[in-house]
Amino acid sequence: SSSPTSSASSFSSSAPFLASAVSAQPPLPDQCPALCECSEAARTVKCVNRNLTEVPTDLPAYVRNLFLTGNQLAVLPAGAFARRPPLAELAALNLSGSRLDEVRAGAFEHLPSLRQLDLSHNPLADLSPFAFSGSNASVSAPSPLVELILNHIVPPEDERQNRSFEGMVVAALLAGRALQGLRRLELASNHFLYLPRDVLAQLPSLRHLDLSNNSLVSLTYVSFRNLTHLESLHLEDNALKVLHNGTLAELQGLPHIRVFLDNNPWVCDCHMADMVTWLKETEVVQGKDRLTCAYPEKMRNRVLLELNSADLDCDPILPPSLQTS
């Protein structure tokens, strides 16, 4: 994960406000909010594990890396980071593990340099379609975001507001085509069962896509064709049973791709023949020698690369336990 990190030294803790009369003034450039640590030299502010319930209003204008992890923010309203003057330098924002369950439209507006955003480990029951685009226009101003980290943002089952979680996340990613410049997208550990058709085609700049530790059961309608810049595709720990010819051809056609497929319940029947042939020839699958059959029972733990066509017959009757992960 590419969350903002800091080599910051010389952090200053916040000092108590000296005079209430000053509070109406804009914050001093070197002021540090209460319960935070600041390093102007590293352009970094850390407000970590302090049970904050809202984003500090008096963030210093120099901040480039902002850590607001391990808090209790609950809701990120529109303009949560809008300041006068704006936080024009803020490039990396980490909000992971801050108990956010709602991110509203325009929450990240007025952050012209924001390149990395990490919302991981927040139970996002309500992610506005316009959280990242800021407006409901059919085409929004391009977002400066290059990396978006959304690992483990799935809320508990009883908080999902009776709608598709996959759909909610996809709506936010595609709204207004604002994220056309996105290069890294991490969506690991979100219980995704599917991706709507053609969703990836609308994120053409992707270099790194992490879909590991979900419950994806098929890639049949997931097109990678337009993702010519894609360098890494993480599909470990899903519920994939076989990759079909169309998918294999698309992956093979990507010039820089490395694919990770470990720990999927591969079904080694006659429909696996094309994938086995491809695996033996391709260089794009990392750790391909670790891929093993899960079904049928007689094939369990057989290494895919060691199979030949005589091993792959049809049709297995699978136990109910296979059908989803």
């Epitope: 379609p129 059919s138 598709s164 759909g167 996809v170 709506a171 595609l174 709204a175 069962l193 599917y194 991706l195 709507p196 058709r197 053609d198 969703v199 609308q202 059961v217 098929s218 049949t220 309608y221 049973k241 076989v242 079909h244 429909h271 049809c314 049709d315 109910p320 059908q323 989803t324």
Partner: antibody, heavy 118, light 107 residues
Framework: QVQLQQSGPEVVKPGASVKISCKAS????????MNWVKQSRGKSLEWIGD????????NYNQKFKGKATLTVDKSSSTAYMELRSLTSEDSAVYYC???????????WGQGTSVTVSS | NIVMTQTPKFLLVSAGDRVTITCKAS??????VAWYQQKPGQSPKLLIY???NRSIGVPDRFTGSGYGTDFTFTISTVQAEDLAVYFC?????????FGGGTRLEMK
């Protein structure tokens, strides 16, 4: 909440054409394919085809090529199906249906009855 | 085109019964099968997708299983409101095709 509102029933003469509309609300129209399905009286369901509202790309069941034309108007979040050269065989209820998981239709319109009668 | 053969066509049931409907594909459709319920005078409703995954708000008495060519849909304890026609559908290859339907009626 997701809603698909279809246009009202149609009674048309053989050889004529008809255009059915399906107005979508409650979700981002361009994020999901729209499918069209035919159901003749007392019969099963037949998939006519689908359209990607994002770019207008269509897939048709070969059986309905030349019979049905699928289009969308993104500005009004509306999908359309035109049926031409109608015969009594085309009398049926026609549904639009939003795709969720690829191919599976998670929300359906209320249906539009088309009766071809001279 | 892939043919989905659904059996039986009719089922007479009593409240509390366990009901099983089967669908056989003319060729493998992997795990790309959905099940729908259509009550009289209503539009179809998606119950199950990708063989065994319940759609939002669908009670857990509805389950699906299978892989390849043979699929089963089960209602563990039928209730009066389950009286409807049930359809399987393959979404593995175009054109997507439906089974002929199974009508559930009360004894």
């Amino acid at each position: 909440q997701v809603q698909l509102q279809q246009s009202g029933p149609e009674v048309v003469k053989p050889g004529a054409s008809v255009k059915i509309s399906c107005k979508a609300s409650g979700y981002t129209f361009t994020d999901y394919y729209m499918n069209w399905v035919k159901q003749s009286r007392g019969k099963s369901l037949e998939w006519i085809g689908d359209i990607n509202p994002n770019n207008g790309g269509t897939n048709y069941n070969q059986k309905f090529k030349g019979k049905a034309t699928l289009t969308v108007d993104k500005s009004s979040s509306t999908a359309y199906m035109e049926l031409r050269s109608l015969t009594s065989e085309d009398s049926a209820v026609y549904y639009c249906a939003k795709e969720g998981p690829p191919g599976a239709m998670d929300y359906w319109g209320q249906g539009t009855s088309v009766t071809v009668s001279s | 085109n892939i043919v989905m053969t659904q059996t039986p066509k009719f089922l007479l049931v009593s409240a509390g019964d366990r009901v099983t409907i089967t669908c056989k594909a003319s060729q493998s459709v992997s795990n790309h099968v959905a099940w729908y319920q259509q009550k009289p005078g209503q539009s179809p409703k998606l119950l199950i997708y990708y063989v065994s995954n319940r759609s939002i708000g669908v009670p857990d008495r509805f389950t699906g299983s299978g892989y390849g060519t043979d699929f089963t849909f089960t209602i563990s304890t039928v209730q009066a409101e389950d009286l409807a026609v049930y359809f399987c559908q393959q979404v593995y290859s175009s054109p997507f095709t439906f089974g002929g339907g199974t009508r559930l009626e009360m004894k």
